[in-house]
């Protein structure tokens, strides 16, 4: 029935979070239609959203069965309302994504601190142990679990009337720092795994301050 | 391959002014946070500072504070020393350094080290 | 300011010699220790980080200990191209801090 007028998809890219795993592409559709494929290098292609005019597609579920394998996929270009049909070789057009490797390669998601505490001139702050979309035994995993003694925290604390940001560091989700009695001081994390090349870092947490809600004062 | 490169080092007057730079190839300076430790001649070495190039964080050591300034350009993937109202005790060997941001915070690359001798 | 306090200043030592220096932080440090070689003219080399693992690519004569605020450096058997000074570094805290640093001398 002659040839049909659908382009291949472009600019394939990975877009991931905390594991929750996103590939994106273009173009927007005209008269088209989508379908994903996702394989680890070793497996069997899986069919994932089917058909649709989105330039998107969550493969969250796929990837978070094993973050540490490494993933290709595919997208399939279709006629719309004749999904049947293929491109002249007799087979659909598609393109291929970069490979991608979740543990390696998903952004550390913006950390939260949770709480600090002071006791005399020790502050005790906690970073909110973040839950991700990686299940183990019906559970869901979180960051730390996940990427174990991988995954270190940097702390930037300072004086509220100071610029200078001195820093910690922890491979827990718990700092304990010195500070001088009778000061505010002012707090900001950052997820890092020292290990990585790329995407080594999340952004900062927001920065939380003493005098404020999150905090506990005792005068020991 | 991993580089940082000094340069702008030079000979400058009592009370005078310099800017050094740090190059760095085969990383993102983004990722990494970026220390300039300084070594007066025959002397061992002192920190002077860091600069975290993706929030711009710094901290100073007491001896250059409110005179040094340390800022980055992450397009141009330079970190950058600016030294004001120098001293003779200023006189020493600029090294940049990396600090990979583990729990231990060591420094895995250096610079080679620009000269900057303070006369008067 | 934690201060690291190196012993000893130098050293004169022979090739093949079993070499120890020493860093004493004036307060807990955890095992945020590193130790760095320096020739003359040149930029100081990690050698040891987290006060016992080596860095990739350094020998292994060389390795690091803690015992509480203590901390050593060993050279197992001395060559000739470890002929050099070297720096002790805590970054338990910001500032960072150096010891005084050990120059290693052919006897």
């Known amino acids: 029935s002659g040839t049909t007028n659908t382009v291949a998809a472009y600019n394939l890219t990975w877009k991931s979070t905390n594991f929750k795993t996103i590939l994106e592409w273009e173009p927007k559709p005209v008269n088209q239609v989508y379908t994903v494929q996702i394989s680890t290098k070793s497996g069997d292609w899986k069919s994932k959203c089917f058909y649709t005019t989105d330039t998107e597609c969550d493969l969250t579920d796929e990837i978070v069965k094993d973050v540490k394998q490494t993933y290709l996929a595919r997208v399939f270009s279709y006629p719309a309302g004749n999904v049947e049909s293929t491109g002249s070789a007799g087979e659909p057009l598609y393109e291929n994504s970069p490979e991608f490797t979740p543990y390696l390669e998903t952004n550390l998601g913006q950390p939260t601190i949770q709480s600090f505490e002071q006791v005399g001139t020790k502050v005790n702050v906690t970073v909110e142990d973040e839950r991700t979309l990686v299940r183990r035994n019906n559970t869901f995993l979180s960051l730390r679990d996940v990427f174990g003694k991988d995954l270190i925290y940097t702390l930037y604390y300072w004086k509220s009337s100071s610029s200078g940001k001195k820093t910690a560091k922890t491979n827990t989700n718990e700092f304990l720092i010195d500070v001088d009695k009778g000061e505010n001081y002012c707090f900001s994390v950052q997820a890092v795994i020292p290990s990585r090349t790329v995407n080594r870092k999340s952004t900062d947490s927001p920065v939380e301050c003493m005098g404020q809600e999150k905090g506990e004062f005792r005068e020991i | 391959e991993v580089q940082l490169v000094e340069s702008g080092g030079g000979l400058v007057q009592l009370g005078g002014s310099l800017r050094l730079s740090c190059a760095a190839s085969g990383f993102t300076i983004g990722g990494y946070i970026i220390h300039w430790v300084r070594q007066a001649p025959g002397k061992g070495l002192e920190w002077v500072g860091y600069?975290?190039?993706?929030?711009?964080?710094?901290y100073y050591a007491d001896s250059v504070k409110g005179r040094f300034t340390i800022s980055a350009d992450t397009s141009k993937n330079t970190a950058y020393l600016q030294m004001n109202s120098l001293r003779a005790e200023d006189t020493a060997v600029y090294y940049c350094a990396r600090d990979i941001q583990s729990v231990s915070g060591e420094f895995d690359y250096w610079g080679q080290g620009t000269l900057v001798t303070v006369s008067s | 300011d934690i201060q690291m306090t190196q012993s000893p200043s130098s050293l004169s030592a022979s090739v093949g010699d079993r070499v120890t220096i020493t860093c004493r932080a004036s307060?807990?440090?955890?095992?945020?220790v590193a130790w760095y070689q320096q020739k003359p003219g040149k930029a100081p080399k990690l050698l040891i980080y987290?006060?016992?693992f080596l860095y990739s690519g350094v020998p292994s004569r060389f390795s690091g200990s803690r015992s509480g605020t203590d901390f050593t450096l060993t050279i197992s058997s001395l060559q000739p191209e470890d002929f050099a000074t070297y720096y002790c570094q805590q970054h338990y805290t910001t500032p960072p801090t150096f010891g005084q640093g050990t120059k290693v001398e052919i006897k």
């Open positions: 987290s006060a016992s």
């Open positions: 600069i975290d190039p993706s929030n711009g964080y710094t």
């Open positions: 307060q807990d440090v955890n095992t945020a």
